[in-house]
């Protein structure tokens, strides 16, 4: 028995930020779960993790340097990615594991979302910017 995941086929990040919503065929209310977002065809990079527990508040973290936040719905987790670089344009896959109460469940691999980062090239700002124009 597998959880099905729906994602938008493509999202464009115009300002180096994007909201990616992962919709599940499973209600996460009162479950202990680990939702994650993975980058690349081989899902090699774990971009962001949202860990939910019935007794604690949501934990959101990235171990790979991404600036991310997460929000929980009854049957969805939305990942908010900021400060994306143009070269991080790639396919991103939602993953979900429900641990407690049993049974352990995970998802069928989704089709993924291509995130096209079109925003400003994030460059360090100059030390002495010129005078601002009125």
């Amino acid at each position: 028995n597998k959880i099905l995941v729906k994602q938008s086929p493509m999202l464009v990040a115009y300002d180096n930020a994007v909201n990616l919503s992962c919709k599940y065929s499973y209600n996460l209310f009162s479950r202990e779960f680990r939702a994650s977002l993975h980058k690349g065809l081989d899902s090699a990079v774990e971009v962001c993790v949202v860990y939910g527990n019935y007794s604690q508040q949501l934990q959101v973290y990235s171990k790979t340097g991404f600036n991310c936040d997460g929000k929980l719905g009854n049957e969805s987790v939305t990942f908010y990615l900021q400060n994306l670089y143009v070269n991080q344009t790639d396919i991103y896959f939602c993953k979900i594991e429900v641990m407690y109460p049993p049974p352990y469940l995970d998802n069928e691999k989704s089709n993924g979302t291509i995130i096209h980062v079109k925003g400003k090239h994030l460059c360090p700002s100059p030390l002495f910017p010129g005078p601002s124009k009125p």
Partner: antibody, heavy 119, light 111 residues
Framework: QVQLVQSGAEVKKPGSSVKVSCKAS??????????VAWIRQAPGQGLEWIGQ???????YYNPSLKSRVTITADKSTSTAYMELSSLRSEDTAVYYC???????????WGQGTLVTVSS | DIQLTQSPSSLSASVGDRVTITCRAS??????????LDWYQQKPGKAPKLLIY???SLESGVPSRFSGSGSGTDFTLTISSLQPEDFATYYC?????????FGQGTKVEIK
């Protein structure tokens, strides 16, 4: 036949680490729903769940040991490992690996590995 | 953590006796009609052996004299007619909530 075979007994000094292996045969660590759990039993005491690794590679630990334990698996050799660091005398116990179902009952057990922590 | 309290801690019985061991959880271990409570038998120097899973399902190969019942917080393991090989320690275990926990054990000794 389905079985789990563990590595041999270990004697360790306080503050050191130990790594116990558990080789599965007759089933695959990659099979959906399967996890390998680690459980320990101090001399004359009851059973304590340490944590487990799921077929997906995700790990889950008992909060009481989380800072000191690492569970890994090598699917190519069907072997799971449990490493416990910063050992103290209270960690002296028999360490068991066990196959966990999706409902987390343990239907196949290893023979146990005695880890003795002594200065 | 969910605490499991077994009673009695030990008991003496004779071959042929009906033996009942109880396990009480500090909170319900039921979810969607399933009780996540299991029973194990352990003999000295050996690994535990699964007897009953999901409160009342008999593990394959386990003699039918073993049975489990209960729901919510109160569970029972019954051995209908004690056999010589049944003298051992019995543990209950919950997997409803992390961390998985075990009862302290009930030692069944020969009277």
């Amino acid at each position: 036949q389905v079985q789990l075979v563990q590595s041999g007994a270990e004697v360790k000094k306080p503050g050191s680490s130990v790594k116990v292996s558990c080789k599965a045969s007759g089933f695959s660590l990659s099979t959906g729903g399967v996890a390998v759990a680690w459980i320990r039993q101090a001399p004359g005491q009851g059973l304590e769940w340490i944590g487990q690794i799921y077929y997906s590679g995700s790990t889950y630990y008992n909060p009481s040991l989380k800072s000191r334990v690492t569970i890994t698996a090598d699917k190519s050799t069907s072997t799971a490992y449990m490493e416990l660091s910063s050992l103290r005398s209270e960690d002296t116990a028999v360490y068991y690996c066990a196959r966990s179902s999706a409902h987390y009952y343990f239907d196949v057990w290893g023979q146990g590995t005695l880890v003795t922590v002594s200065s | 953590d969910i605490q499991l309290t077994q009673s009695p801690s030990s008991l003496s019985a004779s071959v042929g006796d009906r033996v009942t061991i109880t396990c009480r959880a500090s909170e319900s271990v039921d979810f969607q009609g399933i009780s996540f409570l299991d029973w194990y038998q352990q003999k000295p120097g050996k690994a535990p052996k699964l007897l009953i899973y999901d409160a009342s399902s008999l593990e394959s190969g386990v003699p039918s004299r073993f049975s489990g019942s209960g729901s919510g917080t109160d569970f029972t393991l019954t051995i209908s007619s004690l056999q010589p090989e049944d003298f051992a320690t019995y543990y209950c275990q919950q997997s409803y909530r992390s961390p998985i926990t075990f009862g302290q054990g009930t030692k069944v000794e020969i009277k």
